[in-house]
């Protein structure tokens, strides 16, 4: 962690990206411990609070304002040196969000991807942002930054993520910044959940009373596996939402979830996936597709699930 023998390491918890009005803890790690330290802001704005003050273990900053955005350093206590303080730490950039209208975030080819594939996350806005930042929820490292490209009154940036591994799955948000205020970021885009499939064995998908049903007949799709999945996800081809249910252990030692679809109207092709609570964005291989056919006179479409939408909170735990 240390940048040199006499150089402390400054870090932020939970993240260097802080919403306006939020709080962040700055830790100055020096000589294998958290000692007393002093804090500096490089642009010297908004520092009256630091003048002559010594902090112990961590500094809790907030509620933050745009003026808090910028580059910070710390010096660790070193009682027997000439100055009493260490050399300055690494620079730490604190970015404050919520200062401009939110951009939009899209995934190409889509948010549901196989392990090893690459996804392009496109952040765009009609605000002329100079830079775009991409941040994954729960990560304390600095967000990725790209220069915005401006075409036809729209600024955008394409972030390439891949080859995809479990560690890259999760909830992404992007932000924009305007010239002259590089660390005062926009409000976050709507969250986009990137799901990686193909990591575990596929579950099996079956229909009760069967895959061919009369119009108006109640249908239940059952997803099951010998693997101890915590959650099952059911998707329907061509639709933008997935359904999820908690898996229930059965007497035959399988783990199963039963998705009631209600009275049959239209058929469709369904798939299901399993996932574990600890990694909600990492899914199994897809079950074999199940074609549900409806005989008789269909009237309107089923209220049905499927491919995960970016707003469905897939990567949040199911409580």
């Amino acid at each position: 962690l240390m940048g040199g023998q006499d150089k402390p390491f400054l870090s932020a918890r939970p993240s260097t990206v802080v919403p306006r009005g939020g709080h962040v803890a700055l830790q100055c790690h020096y000589r294998r411990g958290f000692n007393n330290f002093m804090l500096y802001k490089e642009d010297r704005s908004h520092v009256p609070i630091f003048h002559g003050r010594i902090f112990q273990e961590s500094f809790i900053m907030g509620p933050v304002t745009p003026a808090h955005a910028g580059t910070y350093r710390c010096r660790g206590s070193r009682p027997h040196s000439l100055t009493g303080w260490s050399a300055p730490s690494n620079p730490l950039v604190i970015m404050v969000t919520g200062n401009h209208r939110k951009p939009s975030l899209l995934a190409h080819p889509g948010p549901l991807l196989k392990s090893g594939e690459t996804v392009i996350l496109q952040c765009w806005s009609d605000v002329m942002f100079e830079h775009f930042f991409l941040h994954r929820e729960g990560i304390s490292e600095d967000p990725s930054r790209l220069v915005g490209q401006i075409h036809d009154g729209v600024s955008k940036a394409n972030f390439s993520i891949g080859p995809l591994m479990p560690v890259l799955a999760g909830t992404y948000r992007c932000y924009g910044s305007v010239p002259h205020s590089p660390y005062q970021l926009s409000a976050p885009s709507d969250p986009l959940d990137i799901v990686i499939t193909g990591l575990y064995e596929k579950p099996s998908l079956s229909a009760q009373p069967g895959p061919t049903v009369q119009a108006g007949e109640n249908v239940t799709l059952s997803c099951s596996s010998w693997s101890s999945y915590d959650i099952y996800h059911l998707s329907r081809e061509g639709e933008a939402h997935e359904r999820r249910l908690r898996a229930v252990p059965k007497v035959n030692r399988t783990f199963q979830a039963d998705f009631p679809l209600g009275p049959a109207t239209h058929g469709g092709t369904y798939r299901c996936f399993g996932s574990f609570r600890a990694l909600p964005c990492v899914w199994s291989n897809s079950s074999d597709p199940l074609l549900v056919s409806v005989t008789g006179n269909p009237s309107s479409s089923w209220p049905s699930p499927t491919e995960p939408s970016s707003k469905s909170g897939i990567c949040r735990h199911l409580h």
């Epitope: 918890r13 709080h23 803890a25 830790q27 908004h46 609070i49 003050r53 273990e57 304002t65």
Partner: antibody, heavy 118, light 107 residues
């Protein structure tokens, strides 16, 4: 939304102890601190000190050193104020408030009335 | 310790009036001043911090200004629901200290 819920009113005899709790919700407990403020009858607001919920390090104002102890249970997102050897002059409403090293108290608990009387 | 002297201690005004409360610090507090509103039977609520930054959800009729030792809270158009005690607080150096409060009533 951020919420701080304090324990109920207490009636104590001089010399006894009291422990006031402040349960936080709606934010990550360890990214902010908990300040404690006293409002005595007919008096203004007086800052007692605070505890850094990230490091667990407390800091006390001069008038509140000794008999007053701040503590945390981060597993239940709760801060505590314990007052020992209670005196009649400790009769007051005690508030917890979210805040950090910058001293801004952005959300407050509803207050806990402690009455010390023989 | 830094003393915060608030004035007036009591203020009566009509609905729609512009109301000004002042706070004087015993030394320069470098814009580190917050303002709180406390309604009867309720805890204080943060209105303004860093002299002029409005807290989330605070109506824009509340504004703050000042520098050095002199700070002001202004209510541009007093509403019935603004009846409360208002406190200033310096958050420049510990111990954080509050003004004595200004009680605002409707005429």
């Amino acid at each position: 939304q951020v919420q701080l819920v304090q324990s109920g009113s207490e009636l104590k005899k001089p010399g006894a102890s009291v422990k006031v709790s402040c349960k936080a919700s709606g934010y990550t407990f360890t990214t902010a601190g908990m300040q404690w403020v006293q409002k005595s009858p007919g008096q203004g607001l007086e800052w007692m000190g605070w505890i850094n919920s990230h490091s667990g390090v407390p800091k006390y104002a001069e008038d509140f050193k000794g008999r007053f102890v701040f503590s945390l249970d981060t597993s239940v997102s709760t801060a505590y104020l314990q007052i020992s050897s209670l005196k009649a002059e400790d009769t007051a409403v005690y508030f917890c408030a979210r805040g950090g090293d910058e001293g801004v108290m952005d959300y407050w608990g509803q207050g806990t009335t402690v009455t010390v009387s023989s | 310790d830094i003393q915060m002297t608030q004035s007036p201690s009591f203020l009566s005004a009509s609905v729609g009036d512009r109301v000004t409360i002042t706070c004087k610090a015993s030394q320069d507090v470098s814009t580190a001043v917050a303002w709180y509103q406390q309604k009867p039977g309720q805890p204080p609520k943060l209105l303004i911090y860093w002299t002029s930054t409005r807290h989330t959800g605070v109506p824009d009729r509340f504004s703050g200004s000042g520098s050095g030792t002199d700070y002001t809270l202004t209510i541009s158009s007093l509403q019935a629901e603004d009846v409360a005690v208002y406190y200033c607080q310096q958050h420049y150096s510990t111990p954080w200290t509050f003004g004595g409060g200004t009680k605002v009533e409707i005429k």
